[in-house]
């Protein structure tokens, strides 16, 4: 028996920043569950991890230097990405492992979605305009 | 209160096998990874690998992957791990010991140890 | 595999001196540095985990500090019962590996 997961198949980092949800075909309310973000084809970088319980305070964090926040609905999690770098565009899976009560659950490999990073584009004004016309 | 003990002291001879379990209670089993950590005598600590209960899913340290083997049985909240081939230079003091599932980098509770001797 | 080199590999200290022993990773670990004690004859002990982070039931001489490659931990004032071995181990990345450790003994 395997969790269901839907994620939008494309989102653009205008601002370096992005908000990506993770929506399950179960509900995480009082369940002990690891939610985790994996980034590229073969999933081997592991973003983000959100760790909840029913007892506990959401914990989220990332061993890998991504700077990241979650957010729990009641069959959702929602990753916030930020400080991204161009270079980070790739395509990242949303898992989810569900520990307690027994049985352990996982999750279909999603399709994954597409994240964009865009880089900052600031539009420079001239140090020095020419003379302005008459 | 939380628990890891484990089997008793072994002595094998070279070419043999040996198989250390730990028994694990007081916390729920498929929550936490289990680990096993060796000590040859007078040195350091070595990571052998590592098995989650809940998926037995396993992580193994390159040197021991094609002599070691973790398993679990769940239905007892034991772990066990199986060295073969045994050499001398194996014989070390073998410690299980637990990392969170969801909140993985430490080892908070360990076994008190297996001691096992490899000698002709 | 990322190496971890503990300084110094043993010292000689006094009841109530400060002692500090340094790690070292090969790459950076970020905040992923956990530091144990062992004692002769018995498994190690968790003291600090994510470098600084006390763990429970371990007295407040006990200190970590560090991120990246370079970790630090510190007893502000050795008792007899610290005599021991110490150990770091990075949490970051598979496999998890240990420093060579650092024995410290009565002066």
């Known amino acids: 028996n395997k969790i269901l997961v839907k994620q939008s198949p494309m989102l653009v980092a205008y601002d370096n920043a992005v908000n990506l949800s993770c929506k399950y075909s179960y509900n995480l309310f009082s369940r002990e569950f690891r939610a985790s973000l994996h980034k590229g084809l073969d999933s081997a970088v592991e973003v983000c991890v959100v760790y909840g319980n029913y007892s506990q305070q959401l914990q989220v964090y990332s061993k890998t230097g991504f700077n990241c926040d979650g957010k729990l609905g009641n069959e959702s999690v929602t990753f916030y990405l930020q400080n991204l770098y161009v270079n980070q565009t790739d395509i990242y899976f949303c898992k989810i492992e569900v520990m307690y009560p027994p049985p352990y659950l996982d999750n279909e490999k999603s399709n994954g979605t597409i994240i964009h990073v865009k880089g900052k584009h600031l539009c420079p004004s001239p140090l020095f305009p020419g003379p302005s016309k008459p | 209160q939380v628990q890891l003990v484990q089997s008793g002291a072994e002595v094998k001879k070279p070419g043999a096998s040996v198989k250390v379990s730990c028994k694990a209670s007081?916390?729920?089993?498929?929550?936490?990874?289990i680990h096993w950590v060796r000590q040859a005598p007078g040195q350091g600590l070595e990571w052998i690998g590592c098995?989650?209960?809940?998926?037995?899913?396993?992580n193994y340290n390159e040197k021991f992957k094609d002599r070691a083997t973790l398993t679990v049985d769940t239905s007892i909240s034991t772990a066990y791990m199986e060295l073969s081939r045994l050499r001398s230079d194996d014989t070390a003091v073998y410690f299980c010991?637990?990392?969170?599932?969801?909140?993985?980098?430490?080892?908070?509770?360990w076994g008190q140890g297996t001691t096992v001797t490899v000698s002709s | 595999d990322i190496q971890m080199t503990q300084s110094p590999s043993s010292l000689s200290a006094s009841v109530g001196d400060r002692v500090t022993i340094t790690c070292h990773a090969c790459q950076n670990i970020y905040v992923w540095l956990n530091w144990y004690q062992q004692k002769p004859g018995k498994a190690p002990k968790l003291l600090i985990y994510?470098?600084?982070n006390l763990h429970t039931g371990v007295p407040s001489r006990f200190s970590g500090s560090g991120s990246g490659t370079d970790f630090t931990l510190t007893i502000s004032s050795l008792q007899p019962e610290d005599f021991a071995t110490y150990y770091c181990q990075q949490g970051q990345t598979y496999p998890y590996t240990f420093g060579g450790g650092t024995k410290v003994e009565i002066k």
């Open positions: 994510k470098a600084s």
């Open positions: 098995i989650y209960p809940g998926n037995v899913n396993t």
């Open positions: 007081g916390y729920t089993f498929t929550s936490y990874y």
């Open positions: 010991t637990r990392s969170h599932y969801g909140l993985d980098w430490n080892f908070d509770v």
